[in-house]
Interface confidence: medium
C-alpha cells in the first residue's frame, strides 16, 4: 500500500498531503508524557493509597505503519519521585515515600516477534 | 484521607512538598494530546485501512483526587482531518476522505453517578 500512496500523492492537493504528513509526524511512535496510576503500576495492596494517585512519566506511544508492528521502548531511564503513602486504617499520617518509575527515552516500531524475543530475553536474564 | 494530609506537611522539606504539588499539576484531569486509531474509533470494516492509521486529537485524561471520580469532558469541538482510505482488495487507489473527530476542549473530575447521568441524558436526546 505504501507504493500506491506514492502514486496517489501525484494527483492530490499539496495542502491535503501536508496535513496528512503532519498527522503521521504527530502520531509516530515516540516517548510521550503519560499519567501512570501508581497503585496499578506496582500492584499495591488495596488499602494503600498514594497522594497524588498518579505521576507523570514518558512512555512509548503512537502508531506504527503496519498491523504487525508494535511501538516499543528501546531505552529506559528511571525517575525517582516522592509521594505521600496512606495506609488504611490510619495507624499513622501519610508518609513520604520515594518510588522509582520507568521512563522511556527512545522507542521503535518492532515486529511482534521481536517484541516477544525482547521480553523473553529480559525474563531469562 | 484529605483530612490526614493536614498533618503530613509537618517537618517535610518544602522541596518534597513542592515536587508532590508539581506532580498533581502535571497529572491533573485536562485535555491531553492522544493518538486515536481511526479504524477502532469508528469500528470500520476489517478490509478498510487508513493512512495514517492514527490521528492526533485532544481527549480528557489524567487523574482525579478520589476513587469515585472520573475525568470527563465537559465540552467538545470537532476536528475535520483528511486521510487516505484504502480498501482491500484494491479496486482503486487510496482515496482521500475527510473524517470528523471529537476533540475535548475542557474536562472535569465528575462522580461516576454524574457520568452515568450525563451519558444517559445524551442517549435520551
Amino acid at each position: 500500500t505504501e507504493e500506491t500512496i506514492k502514486f496517489a500523492a501525484a494527483h492530490y492537493n499539496t495542502e491535503i498531503l501536508k496535513s496528512i504528513d503532519n498527522e503521521w509526524r504527530k502520531t509516530q511512535c515516540m516517548p510521550r508524557e503519560v499519567c501512570i496510576d501508581v497503585g496499578k503500576e506496582f500492584g499495591v495492596a488495596t488499602n494503600t493509597f498514594f497522594k497524588p494517585p498518579c505521576v507523570s512519566v514518558y512512555r512509548c506511544g503512537g502508531c506504527c505503519n503496519s498491523e504487525g508492528l508494535q511501538c516499543m521502548n528501546t531505552s529506559t531511564s528511571y525517575l525517582s519521585k516522592t509521594l505521600f503513602e496512606i495506609t488504611v486504617p490510619l495507624s499513622q499520617g501519610p508518609k513520604p515515600v520515594t518510588i522509582s518509575f520507568a521512563n522511556h527515552t527512545s522507542c521503535r516500531c518492532m515486529s511482534k516477534l521481536d517484541v516477544y524475543r525482547q521480553v523473553h530475553s529480559i525474563i531469562r536474564r | 484521607t484529605e483530612e490526614t494530609i493536614k498533618f503530613a506537611a509537618a517537618h517535610y522539606n518544602t522541596e518534597i512538598l513542592k515536587s508532590i504539588d508539581n506532580e498533581w499539576r502535571k497529572t491533573q484531569c485536562m485535555p491531553r494530546e492522544v493518538c486515536i486509531d481511526v479504524g477502532k474509533e469508528f469500528g470500520v470494516a476489517t478490509n478498510t485501512f487508513f493512512k495514517p492509521p492514527c490521528v492526533s486529537v485532544y481527549r480528557c485524561g489524567g487523574c482525579c483526587n478520589s476513587e469515585g471520580l472520573q475525568c470527563m469532558n465537559t465540552s467538545t469541538s470537532y476536528l475535520s482531518k483528511t486521510l487516505f482510505e484504502i480498501t482491500v482488495p484494491l479496486s482503486q487507489g487510496p482515496k482521500p476522505v475527510t473524517i470528523s473527530f471529537a476533540n475535548h476542549t475542557s474536562c472535569r473530575c465528575m462522580s461516576k453517578l454524574d457520568v452515568y447521568r450525563q451519558v444517559h441524558s445524551i442517549i435520551r436526546r
Epitope: - | 494530609i5 493536614k6 503530613a8 522539606n13 518544602t14 513542592k18 498533581w24 499539576r25 491533573q28
Partner: antibody, heavy 122, light 107 residues
Framework: EVQLVESGGGLVQPGGSLRLSCAAS????????IHWVRQAPGKGLEWVGF????????YYADSVKGRFTISADTSKNTAYLQMNSLRAEDTAVYYC???????????????WGQGTLVTVSS | DIQMTQSPSSLSASVGDRVTITCRAS??????VAWYQQKPGKAPKLLIY???FLYSGVPSRFSGSGSGTDFTLTISSLQPEDFATYYC?????????FGQGTKVEIK
C-alpha cells in the same frame, strides 16, 4: 495582574469565631500555596499556616493548631481562615500571601493581600 | 521548628550609608531564605529570595548572601524610601518562620 484581597475582619469577643476570606486572581490558584500571616499591633510577622488548594493539604503553626482551619474553594479562587475559640492574643492584622510557584527559582511570598484587622476584645 | 534570629533589632543610619542586617537560622536551611521590607500600615514586600536572588522590580542596591545558617541583607547606599522594617524568613521547612525584624530609622 496577580491580586489577593482579604475580607471578613472585625471585632469579636473572646471565645468567638470569625471567618476571613482571601480572593485570588491573576494566577492559577489551584496549584499555588496560599499562606496566612498575622501581625499583632507593633509586633513582627508570624506565620499562621497554609493550604495547597488543589492537593488539599494544610498545615498550621502550633499557636493556632486545633482552633484555626484553612480551607479553599477552587471554583471561587478563594482561601478561607476559619478562626474559632479566639483569644485576645489573636488580635492582629491578618494577611494572605501567595507562595511563589514550583517552577520559580525559589520559594517566598511574592504577592500579599492588603491585610484585614481582627480585634478580639470584650 | 527552625528559629530565625535577626540582628540588630533596630539601627539608625543616614541616606547614602551602607547597611547590613544579619539573620541566623537555628539549623541548616540551605539557601531557602527570603527577605522582606515592610512600611507602617502596609503589607510586606519581597526583596530577596533563595538567599541571594533579587526579586523583579527591586532596586539593585539591595543584595543578599549566605547559605546554611548565616545570611545577610545589604543595602549598598541607603535611600530615603528604604527606611522601613526588614524581615528574614526561612522557607526550607514547614512551618515557615520569620526573624523578629530589624527597624531601619533615620539618624
Amino acid at each position: 495582574e496577580v491580586q489577593l484581597v482579604e475580607s471578613g475582619g472585625g471585632l469579636v469577643q473572646p471565645g468567638g469565631s470569625l471567618r476571613l476570606s482571601c480572593a485570588a486572581s491573576g494566577f492559577t490558584f489551584t496549584y499555588s500555596w496560599i499562606h496566612w500571616v498575622r501581625q499583632a499591633p507593633g509586633k513582627g510577622l508570624e506565620w499562621v499556616g497554609f493550604i495547597s488548594p488543589g492537593v488539599g493539604y494544610s498545615y498550621y503553626a502550633d499557636s493556632v493548631k486545633g482552633r484555626f482551619t484553612i480551607s479553599a474553594d477552587t471554583s471561587k479562587n478563594t482561601a478561607y481562615l476559619q478562626m474559632n475559640s479566639l483569644r485576645a492574643e489573636d488580635t492582629a492584622v491578618y494577611y494572605c500571601a501567595r507562595d511563589a510557584d514550583y517552577d520559580y527559582a525559589g520559594w517566598a511570598f511574592d504577592y500579599w493581600g492588603q491585610g484585614t484587622l481582627v480585634t478580639v476584645s470584650s | 521548628d527552625i528559629q530565625m534570629t535577626q540582628s540588630p533589632s533596630s539601627l539608625s543610619a543616614s541616606v547614602g550609608d551602607r547597611v547590613t542586617i544579619t539573620c541566623r537560622a537555628s539549623q541548616d536551611v540551605s539557601t531557602a531564605v527570603a527577605w522582606y521590607q515592610q512600611k507602617p500600615g502596609k503589607a510586606p514586600k519581597l526583596l530577596i529570595y533563595s538567599a541571594s536572588f533579587l526579586y523583579s522590580g527591586v532596586p539593585s542596591r539591595f543584595s543578599g548572601s549566605g547559605s546554611g545558617t548565616d545570611f545577610t541583607l545589604t543595602i549598598s547606599s541607603l535611600q530615603p524610601e528604604d527606611f522601613a522594617t526588614y524581615y528574614c524568613q526561612q522557607t526550607y521547612r514547614i512551618p515557615y518562620t520569620f526573624g523578629q525584624g530589624t527597624k531601619v530609622e533615620i539618624k
